[in-house]
């Protein structure tokens, strides 16, 4: 069976939207009005992995682009990157672990924990227009809570 996907946008808990600053990097910043069109639309695929009531494994692709968020070690540090894939083969139910995030729902907020690196989360800075990154701390200065907005296909 084909993998189930939905289109959505994400905003951090400070209401910053995610935009592409280039082919390989997402940034978080406040957008208003027409500028909201700039925000990235994700194709969130529900993939194979450890699942529970509040934890669902997903892959985050960029809609209509052969790019997926992935988690790799760079200079011995877990790092978030945009990785290009062959669109003929993706998305798939059994995604490689670097592409998998545990979508965790707590109090109507979402966290995205790397399946490859437990306790590392998709994060944004308090500051405006900074890269989205993989952070190893929750509840500190960096933001790990998001809300999801559904987008019609």
């Amino acid at each position: 069976a084909p993998v189930r996907s939905l289109n959505c946008t994400l905003r951090d808990s400070q209401q910053k939207s995610l935009v592409m600053s280039g082919p390989y990097e997402l940034k978080a910043l406040h957008l208003q009005g027409q500028d909201m069109e700039q925000q990235v639309v994700f194709s969130m695929s529900f993939v194979q992995g450890e699942e529970s009531n509040d934890k669902i494994p997903v892959a985050l692709g960029l809609k209509e682009k052969n790019l997926y968020l992935s988690c790799v070690l760079k200079d011995d540090k877990p790092t978030l990157q945009l990785e290009s894939v062959d669109p003929k083969n993706y998305p798939k139910k059994k995604m490689e672990k670097r592409f998998v995030f545990n979508k965790i729902e707590i109090n109507n907020k979402l966290e995205f924990e790397s399946a490859q690196f437990p306790n590392w989360y998709i994060s944004t800075s308090q500051a405006e227009n900074m890269p989205v990154f993989l952070g190893g701390t929750k509840g500190g200065q960096d933001i790990t809570d998001f809300t999801m907005q559904f987008v019609s296909s």
């Epitope: 280039g22 082919p23 682009k65 052969n66 894939v85 062959d86 003929k88």
Partner: antibody, heavy 123, light 107 residues
Framework: EVQLVESGPGLVAPSQSLSITCTVS????????VHWVRQPPGRGLEWLGV???????DYNSALKSRLSISKDNSKSQVFLKMNSLQTDDTAMYYC?????????????????WGQGTSVTVSS | DIVMTQSQKFMSTSVGDRVSITCKAS??????VAWYQQKPGQSPKALIY???NRHTGVPDRFTGSGSGTDFTLTITNVQSEDLADYFC?????????FGAGTKLELK
């Protein structure tokens, strides 16, 4: 053999719109992105935008309000439409295939280029 | 926008020489740089991708190096068919931007 062939009107009157078609062979538009680049006479290259294999687009923000890139995978054609042309839009317009190094995070340059189509904006 | 500066508009060389063409990015572009060769009346031809990798069929006298902000295209044992314009491209950030080009000519 990978080939890209641009076809355009040649001459466009000021304030009119430009439509160029890029017909490709030797690769699939559903798997490869295609860029548009232009080069004014005697000048350097300027990136206009890209259409991804999946159909998404990204544009040069300086031209975004005037540009539209689309494609028809079944006909192996990519289309560039540009509105409100002025004399400084006179250039050679190229389409170029995106490098596809899957698994790379820096996969967004061009490998094969078309021969270009010359566009002159003049009344 | 990221500015790619090719400070030498022209470079004079002789057949058999070694020549280095430089390109400087206004900010860190990692290794997201490509080099292109363009001969008069022709479209650009891809030489180097990801700063240092030769495209298929490109002679090994062409070598790319650099990362971050400083990049070099080196041609060893220059041949007459190498006389052309050379452009660098950064593809780290939108909009993708090219250097203004360096014209390689005979002394």
């Amino acid at each position: 053999e990978v080939q890209l062939v641009e076809s355009g009107p040649g001459l466009v009157a000021p304030s009119q719109s430009l439509s160029i078609t890029c017909t490709v062979s030797g690769f699939s538009l559903s798997r490869y992105s295609v860029h548009w680049v232009r080069q004014p006479p005697g000048r350097g290259l300027e990136w206009l935008g890209v259409i991804w294999g999946g159909g998404g687009t990204d544009y040069n923000s300086a031209l975004k309000s005037r540009l539209s890139i689309s494609k028809d995978n079944s006909k192996s054609q990519v289309f560039l439409k540009m509105n409100s042309l002025q004399t400084d839009d006179t250039a050679m317009y190229y389409c170029a295939r995106n490098t596809n190094y899957y698994g790379s995070t820096y996969d967004h340059a061009m490998d094969y280029w078309g021969q270009g189509t010359s566009v002159t904006v003049s009344s | 926008d990221i500015v790619m500066t090719q400070s030498q508009k022209f470079m004079s060389t002789s057949v058999g020489d070694r020549v280095s063409i430089t390109c400087k990015a206004s900010q860190n572009v990692r290794t997201a740089v490509a080099w292109y060769q363009q001969k008069p009346g022709q479209s650009p031809k891809a030489l180097i991708y990801l700063a240092s990798n030769r495209h298929t069929g490109v002679p090994d006298r062409f070598t790319g190096s650099g990362s971050g902000t400083d990049f070099t295209l080196t041609i060893t044992n220059v041949q007459s068919e190498d006389l052309a314009d050379y452009f660098c491209l950064q593809h780290w950030n939108y909009p993708l931007t090219f250097g203004a080009g360096t014209k390689l000519e005979l002394k």
